[in-house]
């Protein structure tokens, strides 16, 4: 089970020259620590807007802030705790766009951002704070997803500010791609920390992070570094939850699924999650990028259902996950 820890906030040291110098030299490791976590980490932003002209019409805009090339974008209504949901559109840079009602018009705005208009006629529009999720599959970063929703009291024509959320499902390719940079930075960080080992430590206290404050998590390359580099989840408005008797966790997730904080809008999908997630014969939680197998009639090793999306231009093994499932 992964433990969560917040990066502590430094208390100002005692006044004086030594305090000032100590403050300066201690800030550097924390800056480096932040860089260690975020270096090379792409971000996905999501903006949800209700149109003033049609009260039940939404515009969803999503963008990818990363250097890699985008191979697929999936837009969906977010499901319970951000898992599952239902696909509204898939956009491929070369092979076109496919959408599902009530998606009316999905299009590329730039090479790294898309927009989707969702039509609604009162009855067909979901509740106002429904979560919309955008997932970008890119090379070499892997797969990144963020969600957003209208603020509870938003006026028509207004929109939630774009919500950057460098989360949650990074493929191994992305992790390995930045590990070199991370390794260098972290070695330097450890070197600095060792130099400060014999100095009196300043008083630390955990930061009081509001549940609504933006948070982020990046997958660390190893269990050892995970222990040192924990960052809390990105907080995203969860979708409105109808009264329901269903209490089973969807998709047969691992036992720690139940212990996730309620504001966490996504189940993490890093190597650890894959390793501990059973894949049933007709897999109930197979991420969309696993549908990216070549069109040669080849199915993934598990016969889980799913859209047969556009074949991946980088060949049949390009989207293989940590367990070899595609």
């Amino acid at each position: 089970m992964r433990t969560e820890a917040q990066v502590p906030a430094l208390q100002p040291p005692e006044p004086g020259l030594e305090g000032a110098m100590g403050h300066r030299t201690l800030v550097l490791p924390w800056v480096l620590l932040t860089l260690c976590v975020t270096a090379g980490t792409p971000e996905v932003w999501v903006q949800v807007r209700m149109e003033a002209t049609e009260l039940s019409s939404f515009t969803i805009r999503c963008g990818f802030l990363g250097s890699g090339s985008i191979s697929l974008v999936t837009v969906s209504w977010g499901g319970p705790n951000g898992a599952g949901g239902t696909t509204l559109a898939v956009l491929h840079p070369e092979r076109g766009i496919r959408q599902w009602a009530p998606a009316r018009q999905a299009r590329w705005e730039t090479q790294s951002s898309i927009s989707l208009i969702l039509e609604g006629s009162g009855a067909s529009s979901p509740c106002a704070n429904t979560t919309f999720c955008c997932k970008f599959a890119s090379f070499p970063e892997g797969s990144w997803e963020a969600c957003g929703s209208l603020p509870p009291s938003s006026d028509p024509g207004l929109s939630a500010p774009p919500t950057p959320a460098p989360i949650l499902r990074a493929d191994l390719a992305g992790i390995l791609g930045v590990s070199g940079v991370l390794l260098f930075g972290c070695v330097y960080l450890l070197h600095l920390l060792r130099r400060h080992k014999h100095r009196p430590a300043p008083r630390l206290q955990p930061s009081r992070t509001s549940p609504q404050a933006p948070r982020a998590r990046a997958w660390a390359p190893s269990q050892a570094s995970q222990a040192a580099l924990h960052v809390p989840y990105a907080t995203i408005n969860t979708s409105c939850r109808p009264a329901t008797l269903d209490t089973a966790h969807p998709h047969g997730g691992p036992s720690w699924w139940a212990s996730l904080p309620t504001h966490a809008a996504h189940r993490p999908q890093g190597p650890a999650a894959w390793a501990s997630t059973p894949i049933p014969a007709r897999g109930s939680f197979v991420s969309v990028e696993n549908g990216l197998y070549a069109q040669a009639g080849e199915r993934p090793p598990h016969t889980g259902p799913g859209l047969t999306l556009f074949p991946d231009p980088r060949g049949p093994r390009a989207m293989e996950g940590p367990l070899g499932v595609r």
Epitope: G79, T87, S124, G297, L307
Partner: antibody, heavy 120, light 107 residues
Framework: EVQLQQSGPELVRPGASVRISCKAS????????MNWVKQSHGKSLEWIGY????????GYNQNFKNKATLTVDTYSRAAYMELRSLTSEDSAVYYC?????????????WGQGTILTVSS | DIQMTQSPASLSVSVGETVTITCRTS??????LAWYQQKQGKSPQLLVY???NLADGVPSRFSGSGSGTQFSLKINSLQSGDFGSYFC?????????FGGGTKLEIK
């Protein structure tokens, strides 16, 4: 065992409205889209639309946009389809069918069908 | 909308024979196609999903093939329980559409 139990046959007058229900059991209701399909006598199948029970969002075939309204009650685990301004053209068998949501694929379980007869 | 052309519309065959039903789509749907069987007075039952995968409990004498715009359902050594109607359906974007159906009758 997954089951979709639909309401019984309906005989209604032209111009009236009717509400057909589909009660689900044996699975987590909010995890799957519920689709509705029309089959006119001796003809093929026509997709009407779907509803995502988790958030109540629905998508419709444009041909049925002004004819059908889909709703759900997650507490009773039931999906509903209301058909309005009925004419003899609406006489058909109506099915509810479960579809995996995220993957957007096949209908793996179907209700037994509800026969609707519109006649004066 | 994606058009689904299914052929033949009807087929009269004997028990033990092999039949092939085809479904052609108006645009590339990759492998996003399902086949259903419907017996008189009953609801449709899933046979094949994702063009080639047999649904749970479906006998191995049924097989699906094809991708892109051309698909087929093959039934080897027909049995009496196989008679009825067969439909193809795409799920590559909405509106989902079905083929016109193939009625399989005993000769």
């Amino acid at each position: 065992e997954v089951q979709l139990q639909q309401s019984g046959p309906e005989l209604v007058r032209p111009g009236a409205s009717v509400r057909i229900s589909c009660k689900a059991s044996g699975y987590t209701f909010t995890d799957y889209n519920m689709n509705w399909v029309k089959q006119s006598h001796g003809k093929s199948l026509e997709w009407i639309g779907y509803i995502y029970p988790y958030n109540g969002g629905a998508g419709y075939n444009q041909n049925f946009k002004n004819k059908a309204t889909l709703t759900v009650d997650t507490y009773s685990r039931a999906a509903y389809m209301e058909l309005r301004s009925l004419t003899s053209e609406d006489s058909a068998v109506y099915y509810c069918a479960r579809e995996r949501g995220m993957q957007r694929d096949y209908f793996d379980y179907w209700g037994q069908g509800t026969i609707l007869t519109v006649s004066s | 909308d994606i058009q689904m052309t299914q052929s033949p519309a009807s087929l009269s065959v004997s028990v033990g024979e092999t039949v092939t039903i085809t479904c052609r789509t108006s645009e590339n749907i990759y492998s996003n196609l399902a086949w259903y069987q419907q017996k008189q007075g009953k609801s449709p039952q899933l046979l094949v999903y994702a063009a080639t995968n047999l649904a749970d409990g479906v006998p191995s004498r049924f097989s699906g093939s094809g991708s892109g715009t051309q698909f087929s359902l093959k039934i080897n050594s027909l049995q009496s329980g196989d008679f009825g109607s067969y439909f193809c359906q795409h799920f590559w974007g909405t509106p989902y559409t079905f083929g016109g159906g193939t009625k399989l009758e005993i000769k």
